[in-house]
Interface confidence: medium
């Protein structure tokens, strides 16, 4: 798969289509999270390219939701959070690319996948176990090192991408600084290049036409195409649900991503949902800001990301007329604003920015078949092939 | 700080049309996928419609397909839900939420009442 | 497309702790850990309280917590005060037509 970002619901697509319908992934194991059972109802987001896209996670290439499927060993590790306190993060990821759910994920719907294989998702259920998933080093010394970490609680599926899943060759481990800048601009790829994104579903069209072994169409025959990276720009997973404006479908009946900003920022993924320890969650992966990051100089804004030293997380509130805002905020114009809210593509490549209770501002990057994001922004690019070796 | 500020709810007769604003502030209003959520007198949360960031996707429930139209003004940081062949059924609270699938920020909501 | 299912109620006096279970299928629930939990007092908007199964925004308090299990995702209270009465809707996402799907909410009450 080429090294794109996984930032947008169709790239995500792209990627899942890349392998076969529920071809396990080698060392994909999903816990818990399984492709919807075929037969359900499942509003299989059908980029405009005909490609089929998960919500948010889709279009977000579902690589949003995992914190870093790298660091799956964070589960239970206590982080800062934007509050101040710390938190535990769940301890299961799932791997980025499992999240892409194309790949291995128990199976957790019956009807779409044989049940010995994974559960198949639709293309954009991808559940990566997160087990699967190389451990890697707390969260705390991710955050400390400025690595990506997986999502304490597992990768979530990402969104399925409801395209096929064509079968992608493992690429080479690609760890492509895709930094872009904070637009987001930096994401590689198109966010429309995402499965599921009109765009990228034109673009990219199912790997061979190749189709999950249970018939996507007959899963989601009734469903209009999803464009999930309509709805999942640079930002989160939960932020938007339209990464480049694309609008080859413009009334999908699914709804793209939510996002979290603000100060309070859920870091949902603003753009994707954190991942649930054990279950399949949309191909992401998370990276905290680590302490005391800054973001650069923002005009009228003082980046400290964490509090000082020492210093307890304020409340938002209480931190407003501060000289410091609370972990995973920043000091803009006189108040404290979430990095999310102020830097919407804080994330690069598609990530998802929110803020974590005792953690601070995450990204969730984009994670698909083979390819997701890494980095404390997301700025790097590996491919599940990789981490898999 | 972050708020949604919804209006145009109303009392509406079934086959009428209203078209509910949701004003926007405290955040960077085209950067994010926007929904509206309703919630039926004495029943719980049924998600309606979300549109993404740009205005380039809108998603919506089978329940109102075809006949609600979500959109959006960046410009005026402003989300409408343009409701047509409104129903007794469509009678609910109108929130405006931010995010698609994750709702951080709420609006206070707008009461639509669909009776003749 | 059926809601999430929630007791329509739960009780509990103050201190003790209370779980709130919100079951789905696999295509939600269990197929993701997209699930979130709003508070929503009576009159009110809801406020988002947990995400992604067990994450907390900031500013809630770390009295409310959430798991999931299975088709089955939880949230608890710990240390029941009675500002938390309220309505308790969850959510998750949902591989569908409908990519959020809601809960029937329960009604929290403090005894």
């Known amino acids: 798969v080429p090294a794109r970002e996984a930032g947008s619901a169709v790239e995500a697509e792209e990627l899942v289509k890349g392998r076969p319908a529920w071809e396990p992934r080698a060392n994909d194991t999903r816990e818990e999270a399984g492709p919807p059972a075929a037969g359900e109802d499942e509003a299989s987001w059908t980029a405009p390219g005909g490609e089929l896209a998960g919500p948010e996670e889709v279009l977000q290439a579902t690589g949003t939701a995992w914190l870093e499927a790298d660091n799956p060993g964070l589960g239970g590790v206590t982080s800062e959070a934007g509050s101040g306190d710390a938190q535990a993060l769940p301890a299961t990821l799932q791997a980025p690319h499992e999240v892409l759910g194309q790949s291995v994920m128990p199976p957790a719907i019956p009807e779409a996948t044989e049940a010995s294989g994974p559960p198949s998702p639709t293309p954009g259920d991808n559940l990566s176990p997160a087990s699967e998933l190389p451990k890697e080093s707390p969260l705390e010394v991710w955050l400390n090192l400025g690595g990506s970490t997986p999502d304490p609680q597992g990768p979530e599926p990402t969104y399925p991408f409801q395209g096929t899943l064509e079968p992608q060759p493992a690429s080479d481990i690609i760890d492509i600084d895709y930094f872009q800048g904070l637009d987001g601009e930096g994401r590689g790829a198109d966010l429309g290049s995402f499965p599921g994104s009109p765009g990228t579903s034109e673009n990219h069209p199912d790997t061979e036409g190749e189709t999950p072994s249970w018939s996507l169409l007959d899963l989601y025959d009734d469903f209009t195409p999803f464009d999930e990276s309509d709805f999942y720009p640079t930002t989160s997973f939960y932020d938007d649900l339209d990464e480049e404006e694309e609008e080859e479908e413009d009334d999908k009946d699914a709804v793209g991503g939510g996002d979290l900003e603000d100060e309070n920022e859920l870091l949902v993924p603003t753009g994707k949902p954190g991942l649930g320890p054990g279950t399949g969650q949309p191909n992401s992966r998370w990276h905290a800001v680590p302490p005391q990051h800054t973001l650069g100089s923002v005009p009228g804004s003082s980046i400290a990301l964490r509090p000082r030293p020492g210093e307890p997380g304020r409340d938002l509130a209480s931190s407003e007329n501060g000289t410091e805002c609370r972990s995973g905020f920043v000091r803009h114009n006189g108040s404290c604003r979430s990095v999310c809210d102020l830097f919407p593509s804080y994330c690069h490549n598609g990530g998802q920015c929110y803020l974590v209770e005792n953690i601070g501002a995450f990204c969730r990057c984009n994670t698909q078949d083979y390819i997701w994001h890494k980095g404390m922004r997301c700025e790097s690019i590996i491919t599940d092939f990789q981490v898999m070796c | 700080e972050v708020q949604l500020l919804e209006s145009g709810g109303g009392l509406v007769q079934p086959g009428g049309s209203l078209r509910l604003s949701c004003a926007a502030s405290g955040f960077t209003f085209s950067s994010y996928a926007m929904s509206w959520v309703r919630q039926a007198p004495g029943k719980g949360l049924e998600w309606v419609s979300a549109?993404?960031?740009?205005?380039?996707?809108?998603y919506y429930a089978d329940s109102v397909k075809g006949r609600f139209t979500i959109s959006r003004d960046n410009s005026k940081n402003t989300l409408y839900l343009q409701m047509n062949s409104l129903r007794a059924e469509d009678t609910a609270v109108y929130y405006c939420a931010k995010k698609w699938n994750l709702f951080d920020y709420w609006g206070q909501g707008t009461l639509v009442t669909v009776s003749s | 497309q059926s809601a999430l299912t929630q007791p329509a109620s739960v009780s509990g006096s103050p201190g003790q702790s209370i779980t709130i279970s919100c079951t789905g299928t696999?295509?939600?629930?269990?197929?993701?850990?997209?699930v979130s939990w709003y508070q929503q007092y009576a009159g009110k908007a809801p406020k988002l309280i947990i995400f992604d199964v067990s994450k907390r925004p900031s500013g809630v308090s770390n009295r409310f917590s959430g798991s999931k299990s299975g088709d089955t995702a939880s949230l608890t209270i710990s240390g029941l005060q009675a500002e938390d009465e309220a309505d308790y809707h969850c959510?998750?996402?949902?591989?569908?037509?409908?990519?959020?799907?809601f809960g029937g909410g329960t009604k929290l009450t403090v005894l």
């Open positions: 549109i993404s960031g740009s205005g380039g996707s809108t």
């Open positions: 959510s998750s996402y949902r591989r569908l037509r409908l990519p959020v799907l």
């Open positions: 696999s295509t939600d629930v269990n197929g993701y850990n997209y």
